[in-house]
């Protein structure tokens, strides 16, 4: 069945980039890295230069939204993290520019960003019960919780 968000007419308008060049580390202190052109994975790194650097763009919804809605882009590229289905890897989608407006099926580009202490969660707007997650010996994917790891630390100002 279609996710709830696809059935709604909520429109998300781009505000601005709110973070540049940050690294995401999961609860096992594994950093997100590029697996290949399409997928991401997580690995314990000695050298954080190998970690993927992300930019975060903020969107405002057409309804009075209690959530912070964001898009994740690999820094200095035109590749955007895109949700698929549960337990499916997130894809890197190439787009010529950051979308000014997102609605309908394109909400798979958007995530609700939630912080609690040092923990950061990214819930898919298209699949609101699923999070960006790391999984042992697998790509970065969408998952509902354990055994996948859904909480991340944001490391900023990595020179």
């Amino acid at each position: 069945s279609a996710p709830f968000s696809f059935l709604s007419n909520v429109k998300y308008n781009f505000m601005r980039i709110i973070k540049y060049e940050f690294i995401l580390n999961d609860a096992l202190n594994q950093s997100i890295i590029r697996a290949n052109d399409q997928y991401l994975t997580a690995a314990a790194l000695h050298n954080l230069d190998e970690a993927v650097k992300f930019d975060m763009g903020a969107y405002k919804s057409s309804k009075d939204d209690a959530k912070i809605t964001v898009i994740l882009r690999i820094s200095k590229t035109q590749l955007y993290v895109t949700a698929q289905d549960e337990d499916q890897p997130v894809l890197l989608k190439e787009m010529p520019e950051i979308p000014k407006t997102i609605t309908g099926s394109e909400t798979n580009l958007l995530f609700f960003w939630e912080t609690h202490g040092t923990k950061n969660y990214f819930t898919s707007v298209a699949h609101p019960n699923l999070f960006i997650a790391t999984k042992q010996d697998y790509w970065v994917c969408l998952a509902g919780g354990p055994p996948s790891i859904t909480d991340f630390q944001i490391l900023e100002n990595q020179a």
Partner: antibody, heavy 118, light 113 residues
């Protein structure tokens, strides 16, 4: 873990202003919302307003719209709450809280007692 | 504004017994986009700032004893202390963060019977 340390107690005259600071040690406010909450003697908790620094967005309770100013310094380590045109009924303990980008308080300051009296 | 109403205002419970505090919101705090309830519970002891116990209506904060639990959805919520300890004497507040202005319940004072 972030710890919030607030400025000391203040005694103010009616009609004056007070500025309370809230310093984060062990972290910054970058990813968080900041709430300001007050508690009059023997009373419950009342939300005054808040700020989400990453958006530079400030929210105020209607009752304080015209006399409340909430700011954060450039280093994102100190938040300020200024309340003007003070009246005796503003006598309260003022708290800052943060720790989430939703408006609930995971970390709380120790509180700042503001007494308004002529 | 969303009005938060707690009951009872005062509660006296014997040590080791169950304590139940209710919180009712004047409109739903269940957010349809992510199916979460935007409700928190705090404990405030005399002379101290509030302490977060529960957020998202039922998620227990790290370090909070598991005798504390939160339940409910939409407009009706409950904080339960399964076996009251002496150190649980405090005032308890619910808070909605679904919409502005943020609002708190009036508080429930919990004492030992």
């Amino acid at each position: 873990q972030v710890q919030l340390v607030q400025s000391g107690a203040e005694v103010k005259k009616p009609g004056s202003s007070v500025k309370v600071s809230c310093k984060a040690s062990g972290g910054r406010f970058t990813n968080y919302a900041i709430l300001w909450v007050r508690q009059a003697p023997g009373q419950g908790l009342q939300w005054l307003g808040g700020i989400i620094p990453i958006f530079d967005e400030t929210d105020h309770a209607q009752d304080f719209q015209d006399r409340l100013t909430i700011t954060v310094d450039e280093s994102m380590t100190t938040a300020y709450m200024e309340l003007s045109s003070l009246r005796p009924e503003d006598t309260a303990i003022y708290y800052c809280a943060t720790g989430s980008n939703s408006y609930y308080g995971l970390y709380w300051g120790q509180g700042t007692l503001v007494t308004v009296s002529s | 504004d969303i009005v938060m109403t707690q009951s009872p205002d005062f509660l006296a419970v014997s040590l080791g017994e169950r304590a139940t505090i209710n919180c009712k919101s004047s409109q739903s705090v269940l957010y349809s986009s992510d199916n979460k309830n935007y409700l928190a519970w705090y404990q405030q002891k005399a002379g101290q700032p509030p302490k977060l116990l529960i957020y998202w209506a039922s998620t227990r904060e790290s370090g909070v004893p598991d005798r504390f639990s939160g339940s409910g959805s939409a407009t009706d919520f409950t904080l339960t202390i399964s076996s009251l300890q002496a150190e649980d004497v405090a005032v308890y507040y619910c808070q909605q963060y679904y919409s502005l202005p943020i609002t708190f319940g009036q508080g429930t004072r919990l004492e030992i019977k």
